[in-house]
């Protein structure tokens, strides 16, 4: 008789899991010689203690510390790039200026880009048939509560400048409720960080607005500046030729507006 | 119309204790992180304490921790520093001030602190 | 500790005269240095933000320039109610340290 099995709302785990953050965490240890001291089995084995036999609705961070632990990685702290829904453009950035890095480029950030994950209460298995919604089933699932540990974790560690990227085609450019607005604002430690610059990457070709002076930079702008940081905003007109000139600093076109 | 009033000051003997008080009224106080500067009888302006607005967390200069301790009542507006164990070179004047992104936008009118036998 | 240098200590200036305070800080310091004015028996009011930033209700004649180690604050044509005493703040650590101060006094 098959056992009764919760229905979630979201889609279940990533098929072949274990197998992926396993080889992630090889490939990724492989290219970073900072990071060969670790175990990658150490590193599953803490991964899976935070979600297996555990209510996927009743997660915490503190479920999270063994790997947290393991995976405790220095990056520059004024080399920190963080992003709100434009994570492709922000790894296309990263890729080309090899000395900024955003979360997914350190190593636990890197093992869990766009997986889903979740186990049952009471029993070893991983949930490859759905996982819990943040919206509609609970916000203490395993993926919610592992990104909002590791993000945290991430603003707390940046200082001097950091840089936002954020996306001008969305009705909410600073949106409140992302990870960066609800999570990594909030986490900037004023005594370490002297400046936010966010980049607003326009969609539109045509689009020569200021969108700098869009009402959720400017509520953006007061909160960290409540937070003692100073913030300042540059508009990216022409994210391709953005691209290009981080590429080709040389270039002629690169002297005036991107 | 932005205030903030100090009260609490005085003349205290040297390894005395003092309460100051700051009041404040026309912005949301639990919002910023509120400091007190003070400055002393040869006119030097130097930081005491400050508090942080979410988590309430306090910072003081190496000098003074232990003796000095800033609150605050976001519920009722109001700034505190409890100073013990007092020393002659703490007499000064004592603001209350606003932070905003690294500068003091909006300071008291301030309360005057005098150590002395 | 970043030390904030002002001079000179006094300046004695003729009513309309356009004079120059210095702020230099022991190390590089960036844009973050604010200005603050006092006045006798007044608390201090913020002037300029971030070097050379205005503040509204801060009258134009006052300006600053600077970046690195070495600020000025420059003030264009000199009125008697500018007499009193002023502070630069070095922000880049937080937080921050002031000036000794520069007494303007009308002569």
């Known amino acids: 008789v098959p056992r009764w099995r919760q229905q979630w709302s979201g889609p279940g785990t990533t098929k072949r899991f274990p197998e992926t953050v396993l080889a992630r965490c090889v490939k990724y240890t492989e290219i970073h010689p900072e990071m060969r001291h670790v175990d990658c089995q150490s590193v599953w084995d803490a991964f899976k203690g935070a979600f297996i036999s555990k209510h996927p609705c009743n997660i915490t961070e503190e479920d999270y510390q063994p790997l947290m632990k393991l995976g405790t990685q220095t990056v520059p702290c004024n080399k920190i790039l963080l992003w709100s829904r434009i994570k492709d453009l922000a790894h296309q950035f990263t890729q080309v200026q090899r000395d900024m890095f955003t979360l997914e480029d350190t190593l636990l950030g890197y093992l869990a880009d766009d997986l889903t994950w979740c186990g049952e209460f009471n029993t070893s298995k991983i949930n490859y048939q759905s996982c819990p919604d943040w919206r509609k089933d609970c916000s203490n699932n395993p993926v919610s509560v592992f990104w909002k540990t590791v993000s945290r974790r991430f603003a707390e560690a940046a200082c001097d400048v950091v840089h936002v990227m954020l996306n001008g085609s969305r009705s909410k450019i600073f949106d409140k409720n992302s990870t960066f607005g609800s999570v990594e604002v909030h986490n900037l430690q004023p005594e370490k960080v002297q400046t936010l610059e966010a980049w607003v990457i326009h969609g539109g070709r045509e689009d020569s607005r200021d969108l700098c002076q869009d009402p959720t930079i400017k509520e953006l702008e007061s909160i960290i500046s409540k937070r003692n940081i100073q913030f300042s905003c540059k508009n990216i007109y022409r994210p391709d030729k953005f691209l290009q000139c981080v590429k080709n600093p040389e270039d002629s076109s690169c002297t005036s507006e991107i | 119309e932005v205030k903030l009033v100090e009260s609490g000051g005085g003349l205290v003997q040297p390894g005395g204790s003092l309460k100051l008080s700051c009041a404040t009224s026309?912005?949301?106080?639990?919002?910023?992180?509120m400091f007190w500067v003070r400055q002393t009888p040869e006119k030097r302006l130097e930081w005491v304490a400050y508090?942080?607005?979410?988590?309430?967390?306090?910072y003081y200069p190496d000098t003074l921790k232990g003796r000095f301790t800033i609150s605050r009542d976001n519920a009722n507006n109001t700034l505190y520093l409890q100073m013990s164990r007092l020393k002659s070179e703490d007499t000064a004047m004592y603001y209350c001030?606003?932070?905003?992104?690294?500068?003091?936008?909006?300071w008291g009118a301030g309360t005057t602190v005098t150590v002395s036998s | 500790d970043i030390v904030m240098t002002q001079s000179p200590a006094t300046l004695s200036v003729t009513p309309g005269d356009r004079v120059s305070l210095s702020c230099r800080a022991s190390?590089?310091?960036?844009?973050?240095l604010h200005w603050y004015q006092q006045k006798s028996h007044e608390s201090p009011r913020l002037l300029i933000k971030?070097?050379?930033q205005s503040i509204s209700g801060i009258p134009s004649r006052f300006s600053g320039s600077g970046s690195g180690s070495d600020f000025t604050l420059s003030i264009n044509s000199v009125e008697p109610e500018d007499v009193g005493v002023y502070y630069c703040?070095?922000?880049?650590?937080?937080?921050?340290?002031f000036g000794g101060g520069t007494k303007l006094e009308i002569k």
């Open positions: 508090i942080s607005n979410g988590d309430g967390n306090t």
């Open positions: 971030y070097v050379s």
């Open positions: 703040q070095n922000a880049h650590s937080f937080p921050s340290t």
């Open positions: 190390q590089s310091i960036s844009d973050f």
């Open positions: 026309g912005f949301t106080f639990s919002d910023y992180y």
């Open positions: 001030a606003r932070s905003i992104s690294r500068y003091f936008d909006v």
